[in-house]
Amino acid sequence: QQQTLPKPFIWAEPHFMVPKEKQVTICCQGNYGAVEYQLHFEGSLFAVDRPKPPERINKVQFYIPDMNSRMAGQYSCIYRVGELWSEPSNLLDLVVTEMYDTPTLSVHPGPEVISGEKVTFYCRLDTATSMFLLLKEGRSSHVQRGYGKVQAEFPLGPVTTAHRGTYRCFGSYNNHAWSFPSEPVKLLVTGDIENTSLAPEDPTFPADTWGTYLLTTETGLQKDHALWDHTAQNLLR
């Protein structure tokens, strides 16, 4: 006899990276017929939802209207059908961004390179942080972590055309509180064949559409959040 129900899915809309004072919704999807959902934050009960009518609802939303450092951290959810509880969901790391300062991102030898060249990104922030994060914009939200007193190096090694795209970096004050994003740096990698078009599976965006990027990233998740690439989430743990 089954003692627990399958774990629900948890995700954040529009994104798990939330600028301070902006809104975010944590979604928890369980099963139709669930009579109660519980959202837990850092191991403590955060909120409860009892859907009405339960047989017509399989997803609930927990709204955070004003993101701040107190709301940043690890969330999970569970649901109940009758007296039977589910396994807990995976952990959702909710990150508050736009804290304190803005780092500077640079690339060596430059933003336009030939396939096979060694490329290194440098993220610099003069305030009190020793952890840095480099993100490549696009659906899979690739994140690299680096360390340094005021600057971190991110060696990409010999690059291929797959490295083409727009990069930003953050200073991290703790796992869940990040700085403002740096200005974007667009890396252009020219292959043997003269073709400088961007890889279609990894779209990039102009400097003023970081918010659009976040929404676009999450759109892929909404289509099938079970298959979403959790690279960025796992890196936080």
């Epitope: 009960l45 955060f46 909120a47 409860v48 927990f62 709204y63």
Partner: nanobody, 127 residues
């Protein structure tokens, strides 16, 4: 913006009952989950009870189950907490709080999830 003002506190004898009220200003009261918290001398603020924006869903701390009843009147912008069989451990400052929710059936439990707080009303239980 929501302003919250608690009332109904004071001195009460052990074994008696009291009713705390919280008046909210603003036209969006019916969109907020409302909660009661309390803070005893030398202790952290603790959750007591909460009610969803629709009033259909309530949630109580284990220590509050059975003796406490939370209710709301969206027409009057008020939320109340009835406390029965009060005991010395109920001595505390009681706070009303409001949390904006996406769904009418959500109650917020964690203090971090509340956007607005009242100034509190003191309840003192005498033996």
């Amino acid at each position: 913006q929501v302003q919250l003002v608690e009332s109904g506190g004071g001195l009460v004898q052990a074994g008696g009952s009291l009713r705390l009220s919280c008046a909210a200003s603003g036209r969006t009261f019916s969109r907020y989950s409302m909660g009661w918290f309390r803070q005893a001398p030398g202790k952290e603020r603790e959750f007591v009870a909460a009610i969803s924006s629709s009033g259909d869903v309530t949630h109580y701390a284990d220590s509050a189950k059975g003796r406490f009843i939370i209710s709301r009147d969206n027409a009057k912008n008020t939320v109340s907490l009835q406390v029965n069989s009060v005991n010395l451990e109920d001595t505390a400052v009681y706070y009303c709080a409001a949390s904006l929710t996406a769904r009418a059936t959500t109650v917020t439990v964690h203090p971090n999830g509340y956007n607005y707080w009242g100034q509190g009303t003191q309840v003192t239980v005498s033996s």
